[in-house]
């Protein structure tokens, strides 16, 4: 025998109190699949959360964060304070990146500048709190007698073409 509840579409629930009639989800609740015996309570976006998508009878509300905060976790389960570029968030709030580190985003941690010499390169542009070092030519290219030879054109990868 087929379960009569399987005929209940999304946006309804199978009401055991009414002989398994498909009843619409009450206000502020939803069912995203058919055959549900209950409707789920809609998520409410409060405080630093703001509503990105309203709840409907068939789908939950979606939240994001108010300006000055950014989402963390699956489905934006948490909001974390933004910092400025060149800073990172600590337990005591936003702190400037230490010398030798940078953060080019409003979130995340300060990361060490690239050590160009480890890659056999010289420094072309110094790093800042907001930007990594840009490495330049290898010291061998700068020595007397080094030729200013342009390398061969890089191999183009499939699906990409220079603009």
């Amino acid at each position: 025998l087929q379960d009569p509840c399987s005929n209940c579409p999304a946006g309804t629930f199978c009401d055991n109190n009414r002989n398994q009639i498909c009843s619409p989800c009450p206000p502020n609740s939803f069912s995203s699949a058919g055959g549900q015996r209950t409707c789920d309570i809609c998520r409410q976006c409060k405080g630093v959360f703001r509503t990105r998508k309203e709840c409907s009878s068939t789908s939950n509300a979606e939240c994001d964060c108010t300006p000055g905060f950014h989402c963390l976790g699956a489905g934006c389960s948490m909001c974390e304070q933004d910092c400025k570029q060149g800073q990172e968030l600590t337990k005591k709030g936003c702190k400037d990146c230490c010398f030798g580190t940078f953060n080019d985003q409003k979130r995340g941690i300060c990361r060490p500048w690239t050590n160009c010499s480890l890659d056999g390169k010289s420094v072309l542009v110094n790093g800042t709190k907001e930007r990594d070092v840009v490495c330049g030519p290898s010291p061998a290219d700068l020595s007397p007698g080094a030729s200013s030879v342009t390398p061969p054109a890089p191999a183009r990868e499939p699906g990409h073409s220079p603009q």
Epitope: L124, V125, T128, R131, V134, C135, G136, P137, D141, T150, P151, P154, R156, E157, H160, S161, P162, Q163
Partner: nanobody, 125 residues
Framework: QVQLVESGGGVVQPGRSLRLSCAAS????????MGWYRQAPGKQRELVAS????????NYADSVKGRFTISRDNSKNTMYLQMNSLKPEDTAVYYC??????????????????WGQGTQVTVSS
Amino acid sequence: QVQLVESGGGVVQPGRSLRLSCAASGSTFSIVAMGWYRQAPGKQRELVASIITGDGDTNYADSVKGRFTISRDNSKNTMYLQMNSLKPEDTAVYYCYARTGEGSSWLEGHEYDYWGQGTQVTVSS
């Protein structure tokens, strides 16, 4: 590939000014940063000034700070070096340099150096 062509070099008296230009062509969208290097006879090539193509942030060698100014015009794909209060020790071949790689989709994971052919600057009375 990127091609770089310098111009503007010449012979000038101490205390005078010159402006070097470096015209870039080819895959200029992939250029991350550019710089001016110079090389005097028998000496190592040294970085004079550099610039980030995106935000225009600049760096200078201590020996030219306050006298030289690096700039770029992205619409013309050209970088400049304005050299004021020139000194005899500024005499060298000046090379334009471009760094490509980071931030370009088809060059992801690759970085390439490109150099111009050089332009001679002689400061002499």
